[in-house]
Structures are given as C-alpha cells and as structure tokens.
C-alpha cells in the first residue's frame, strides 16, 4: 500500500527568460515524517534547488495555495529564469533520520526557457 504520493502535475513548463517559473508539487500525507526538497536532475550529481530548513536560496520562494484537506502544497517559484536553469526538476520527500533518507520522488517537471 502506498504510504503517500508526491504529485507533480506538470510534465513540462515553458518560461521566458527573465520571468519566474512556478513548479507545482503536492504531497498527500505528512507521514512518514520528513522534509520536502527540490532538485534539478536525478542521480548523485543532482543539484539542490530548495531545502526549507537550511541553505540560502535567494531566487526561490514557496507559493503554497494549499486549501485542500487531502493534500499539501510544496510548490516553489524560481525568479529571473535564464537558459542555464533549463532541466528537469524533482520534488522529493525524505524520511527523517540520521541522516534523512529519500523516500519518494515526484515524476519531475521539465523546465524549458524561451528567449525574451
């Protein structure tokens, strides 16, 4: 039985350079306990895009519009998009521990950047 779902509803998002990109992610349960983090790319070389607890992410803001009882909104907005930001972004649920361990990832959202 699935303990929770990590839902990234958009397979792809296209944004003009200089604009902001909103990457949507909803999670159906807080349990197992642990944080949500955002990454660009997959595998060991993936880049951390946002971690609520620690780090400095000046271009990233949270944009929760979660009023639904049955899921929670962990969406983010990335400002001032450039071509270097293109790639596939993953919303990842971790299970709290020492260290935290990856529990489940969303399917990913591919960000493409259009010229101004």
């Amino acid at each position: 039985e699935e303990e929770l779902q990590v839902i990234q509803p958009d397979k792809s998002v296209s944004v003009a350079a200089g604009e902001s990109a909103i990457l949507h992610c909803t999670v159906t349960s807080l349990i197992p306990v642990g944080p949500i983090q955002w990454f660009r790319g997959a595998g060991p070389a993936r880049e951390l895009i946002y971690n609520q607890k620690e780090g400095h992410f000046p271009r990233v803001t949270t944009v929760s519009e979660s009023t639904k009882r049955e899921n929670m909104d962990f969406s983010i907005s990335i400002s001032n998009i450039t071509p270097a930001d293109a790639g596939t972004y993953y919303c990842v649920k971790f299970r709290k521990g020492s260290p935290d361990t990856e529990f489940k990832s969303g399917a990913g959202t591919e960000l493409s950047v259009r010229a101004k």
Epitope: E1, E2, E3, L4, T28, S29, L30, I31, P32, V33, G34, P35, I36, Q52, T62, V63, S64, S66, R69, E70, N71, M72, D73, F74, S75, I76, R95, K96
Partner: antibody
Framework: EVQLVESGGGLVKPGGSLRLSCAAS????????MSWVRQTPGKGLEWVAT????????YYPDSVKGRFTLSRDNAKNSLYLQMNSLRAEDTAVYYC???????????WGQGTTVTVSS | DIVITQSPASLAVSLGERATISCRAS??????????MHWYQQKPGQPPKLLIY???NLESGVPDRFSGSGSRTDFTLTINPLQAEDVATYYC??????????FGGGTKVEIK
Amino acid sequence: EVQLVESGGGLVKPGGSLRLSCAASGFTFSSYVMSWVRQTPGKGLEWVATISSGGTYTYYPDSVKGRFTLSRDNAKNSLYLQMNSLRAEDTAVYYCASSVDGSAFDYWGQGTTVTVSS
Amino acid sequence: DIVITQSPASLAVSLGERATISCRASESVDSYGMSFMHWYQQKPGQPPKLLIYRASNLESGVPDRFSGSGSRTDFTLTINPLQAEDVATYYCHQSSENLPWTFGGGTKVEIK
C-alpha cells in the same frame, strides 16, 4: 458516516498491560493515517502514537516510547494500541483519531477510559 | 519539544460578540508557506472536533463564523458572532515535522 469505536479500556495495576482497539467504518481506512490521543483533567490533550496508512511507520512521544506499540489491520479496518508497563500517569481517556493528510485529526472516536491504580 | 502557550484559559463573551483565542508556539510550525497549526472544539462529554486546519482553512461543515489566522509562531481563532452553541473548550494543536506533536492547554468559552 464516519465512525471510530474504541474498546479495551479498564482498570489495571501499575506495571500491567492493556490492549486498546479501534474499529473504523464509513471511510477508506487504508488511506488514512491513524493516531491515539489521550486526555486527562490535569494535562489536557496529549498525542500518544501515530501510524502511517500502510502501517510501516510509527511515531511516539518519549513518554510512551518503548512501552506502547501501535499497529493496524487494514483488512479488518482496525487499529490497536498495546500498552505495557503501565503507570499511574497513563490514566486518561484514550481517543482514536483519523487523519487524511497526517497532520490534523479529522475524526475522533468517543474514547475509552484507562485507569492505572493499585 | 514545541511548547504551545494558549491564552486566555477562560473567556466570557456576550452573545453576538467576538471571541478571540491565541496560541503561541515556542518555534515556527511553518513549512513551504503552510502553517501546521490546527484548532478543535470540545463540548462536555464529547470528543474534540476539527474546526480549522493549517491555520486558516475551515473544515467542511463548520460554520463560517469560525476563522483562523496567523503564521510561524502566533495564531488566532476567532468566533464572530458568538452563538450559544459555541460554548465549549477550544484547543490548538501543532503537527510540524518536529515531533512530538503538542496541544495548547485549552480555552473555555462561556457566555457573559
């Protein structure tokens, strides 16, 4: 209609054991995080235990960790709290509660009373 | 542990007037712009009932005279206008990632 019905409470001596049960109906039990919360006149409401929808993950406060064990049987729509090494301070009304998202408690049973006394 | 200080312990309000209850958490209960603070109503001899989830969202079937606000550490439940059937004890509850989950001490609301 959602129903949570607790049973198994009673009077037990310090050091003794009890097993509380919660029978659920009216919702998709296997999709819900389930918890026990207790209430005493002196300490108010206290979270006791939580189990994930599939039963893999359990969480307890330090006050009951190692003494209480939470389990569930999704085929029977039932939740169980095994309470060992009971202490006087465990005396309370124990409520079974459901949560669709693992955060707020949507529905509560009527409670079952546990009294630990010699 | 996150300690929740709820105030006042009791409150007497005239029918039709506004009742305001506060909860302060010892650290932030926010994540990704969501506040994991919830409000419950308990009437004598009954279990608690969820009123407000995640600080400001009205649970289905709850009258809109109940409202919640706040973020991070400071939260408020407002009942306006107060009705006779609102006489009860109200509790806040935080369910942040930092276990254990904890409750406020309760506020007993009575009619003046």
